[in-house]
Amino acid sequence: APVRSLHCTLRDAQLKSLVMSGPYELKALHLQGQDLEQQVVFSMSFVQGEESNDKIPVALGLKAKNLYLSCVLKDDKPTLQLESVDPKNYPKKKMEKRFVFNKIEINNKLEFESAQFPNWYISTSQAESMPVFLGGTRGGQDITDFTMQFVS
C-alpha cells in the first residue's frame, strides 16, 4: 500500500509556530489570530524504520509542496535543510534515511530525532524569528520539545 500521510502543524514548547523564511528555510515565531494562517502545514508520512510505542519513524514534507525536511552534513556538522524532491516519487514507504525522523513522545513532550544522526533533534531558538535547525543538545537553551496539531 502507498505511504499514509497526515496533515499537521507544530508548535515548540514556547508555543512558537513554524513559518517559511525564504524558499528553503523555516523560522519559529509567536503567531496569533489570523496570522496563524501563515504557519506551515506539514504532510507527515509514516515511513519504514525501527518503531516502538514511543518512537515512530516519519518524514516531514510541506503540504502541497515538493519539499521535505532532511538532515545532511555541511562543513562536517549535521544540518537541517528543506530539500526539493520529484513529486512523482515522493512520499514513499522507504524514504532515504536523511528524510527520516524518529517522532518520540514521552510525558507530553514530542521530539523529532534525526534517523541519520542519532541524538540530533529538530530545534528552535529561545529568540523570536530564528531559523529552525538541527541541534545536538536536549534540555539546554535550545528547544527540542514540540506539540502537534493534526488538521484536515
Epitope: 500500500a1 513522545e105 507530553n108 514530542l110 493534526f150
Partner: antibody, heavy 119, light 107 residues
C-alpha cells in the same frame, strides 16, 4: 478486564460548558492514544477529539475546533473533554474510545454519556 | 474530506442467511478501513480493521474484503445476536469518517 467508563454528561443550556471524564482500567493507559466519538440522536458516528498517548498531539474537526479541549491525566488513568460554547447540534451520546490518529481505528469503547444542549 | 457511503441503509434477513454490506469511499483509501457493530443502546464494537483483519474474539462468520474505493462486509451465516447497526470507517486521511450505518434486522 479492559474498560472505559464515561461520566459528566447532562442537560445544559446553549452557550454553557460541560466537562466529560473517562476512567480507564485494565490496560496501560499512558501507552494508548485516546479519542472522543459522538453520536447524535438516531444518527451516525463523528470523531470529535483526539489526544496522543503522552498528550503532545491533538486533533479536532472544524465542527468543534476552538470550543472543545481534550486532555488526559496519565497518573490517574483519566481522559477529559472540556466542552465550551455548547450548541444544540452538540447534543448526543459521547463515547470515550481507545485509538486515534496513529492506529486509525478504535478498539475499545466506553458505554457513552448523554449530552443534551437545550434551552 | 473522504466521504463513506454504505449500502443498503437497512436490510432484513433470516437466521442462517449470508448477509453482505458494502461501503464506498469517495477516494482511494488503500485498505485503511474498519467495520464496527453497534447493538441498540450499546457502544460500537470493533469487528474488522485493515479491511479484512478480524479483531480479537470476533467470530469467524464475519469477514471483510475489498480494495481501492469499494469494500464489502459479510456475515456468512446470520445469527440472532447479529441484529445491530454496522458502520464502516476509513483511516487513510484526516478526518477519519464513518459511513451512515446499515441497520440489520431479522425477518
Amino acid at each position: 478486564e479492559v474498560q472505559l467508563v464515561e461520566s459528566g454528561g447532562g442537560v445544559v443550556q446553549p452557550g454553557r460548558s460541560l466537562r466529560l471524564s473517562c476512567s480507564a482500567s485494565g490496560f496501560i493507559f499512558s501507552r494508548y492514544d485516546m479519542s472522543w466519538v459522538r453520536q447524535a440522536p438516531g444518527k451516525g458516528l463523528e470523531w470529535v477529539a483526539y489526544i496522543s498517548h503522552g498528550g503532545a498531539g491533538t486533533y479536532y474537526p472544524d465542527s468543534v475546533k476552538g470550543r472543545f479541549t481534550i486532555s488526559r491525566d496519565n497518573s490517574k488513568n483519566t481522559l477529559f473533554l472540556q466542552m465550551d460554547s455548547l450548541r444544540p447540534e452538540d447534543t448526543g451520546v459521547y463515547f470515550c474510545a481507545r485509538g486515534g490518529v496513529t492506529k486509525g481505528y478504535f478498539d475499545v469503547w466506553g458505554q457513552g454519556t448523554p449530552v443534551t444542549v437545550s434551552s | 474530506d473522504i466521504q463513506m457511503t454504505q449500502s443498503p441503509s437497512s436490510l432484513s434477513a433470516s437466521v442462517g442467511d449470508r448477509v453482505t454490506i458494502t461501503c464506498r469511499a469517495s477516494g482511494n483509501i488503500h485498505n485503511y478501513l474498519t467495520w464496527y457493530q453497534q447493538t441498540p443502546g450499546k457502544a460500537p464494537k470493533l469487528l474488522i480493521y485493515n479491511a479484512k483483519t478480524l479483531a480479537d474474539g470476533v467470530p469467524s462468520r464475519f469477514s471483510g474484503s475489498g480494495s481501492g474505493t469499494d469494500y464489502t462486509f459479510t456475515i456468512s451465516s446470520l445469527q440472532p445476536e447479529d441484529i445491530a447497526t454496522y458502520y464502516c470507517q476509513h483511516f487513510w486521511s484526516i478526518p477519519y469518517t464513518f459511513g451512515q450505518g446499515t441497520k440489520l434486522q431479522i425477518t
